[in-house]
């Protein structure tokens, strides 16, 4: 497994998909740390397999962004601020 230190903190970085020389597009990228806390009693009662510790993951997403038109004539998001927020997991 990669070392946690290998993953930079959640911050604005150049978006390699849409940036042009002299015209960078920024994207929120990096790692957010998960929070662990004792599972509340009322939550425990609803669990099929009870867990004493609950971990809460967050993901690096845009807190704010502008929509800009880039070369190729399409709109992209140019992120202006980042934060660690609820992860939305992809369901197949």
């Amino acid at each position: 497994a990669p070392d946690v230190q290998d993953c930079p903190e959640c911050t604005l970085q150049e978006n390699p998909f849409f940036s042009q020389p002299g015209a960078p597009i920024l994207q929120c990228m990096g790692c957010c740390f998960s929070r662990a806390y004792p599972t509340p009693l009322r939550s425990k009662k609803t669990m099929l397999v009870q867990k004493n510790v609950t971990s809460e993951s967050t993901c690096c997403v845009a807190k704010s962004y502008n929509r800009v038109t880039v070369m190729g004539g399409f709109k992209v998001e140019n992120h202006t601020a980042c934060h660690c927020s609820t992860c939305y997991y992809h369901k197949s």
Partner: nanobody
Framework: QVQLQESGGGLVQAGGSLRLSCAAS????????MGWFRQAPGKERESVAA????????YYASSVRGRFTISRDNAKKTVYLQMNSLKPEDTAVYTC??????????WGQGTQVTVSS
């Protein structure tokens, strides 16, 4: 340039799923970034999702994050867009694109996705 052909569009009810495919042919260097774009009637084309050559890096528009998943199979020269929890506002013509270094110079013809409420 790369030739791109999309498939998988159609009519689906809100909350449903579709999987779009984009097959590449021609000068298909594996270093190409691939992406999905969409254009709704009366609106500008917008980026939806993009993926780099080795699938190590992806991009999603905020409006589709957590609902759409982009993936690629370099052996099949195909990129996919799995679209779940579709909403009426996802209705658009979805076009596949290929590019390098921030320049998107190859486009498919597009496939219509209609989400009814």
């Amino acid at each position: 340039q790369v030739q791109l052909q999309e498939s998988g569009g159609g009519l689906v009810q809100a909350g449903g799923s579709l999987r779009l495919s984009c097959a590449a042919s021609g000068r298909t260097g594996s270093t190409y970034d691939m992406g999905w774009f969409r254009q709704a009637p009366g609106k500008e084309r917008e980026s939806v999702a993009a993926i780099n050559w080795d699938s190590a890096r992806t991009y999603y528009a905020s409006s589709v994050r957590g609902r759409f998943t982009i993936s690629r199979d370099n052996a099949k020269k195909t990129v996919y867009l799995q679209m779940n929890s579709l909403k009426p506002e996802d209705t658009a013509v979805y076009t596949c694109g290929a590019g390098e270094g921030g320049t998107w110079d190859s486009w498919g013809q597009g496939t219509q996705v209609t989400v009814s409420s």
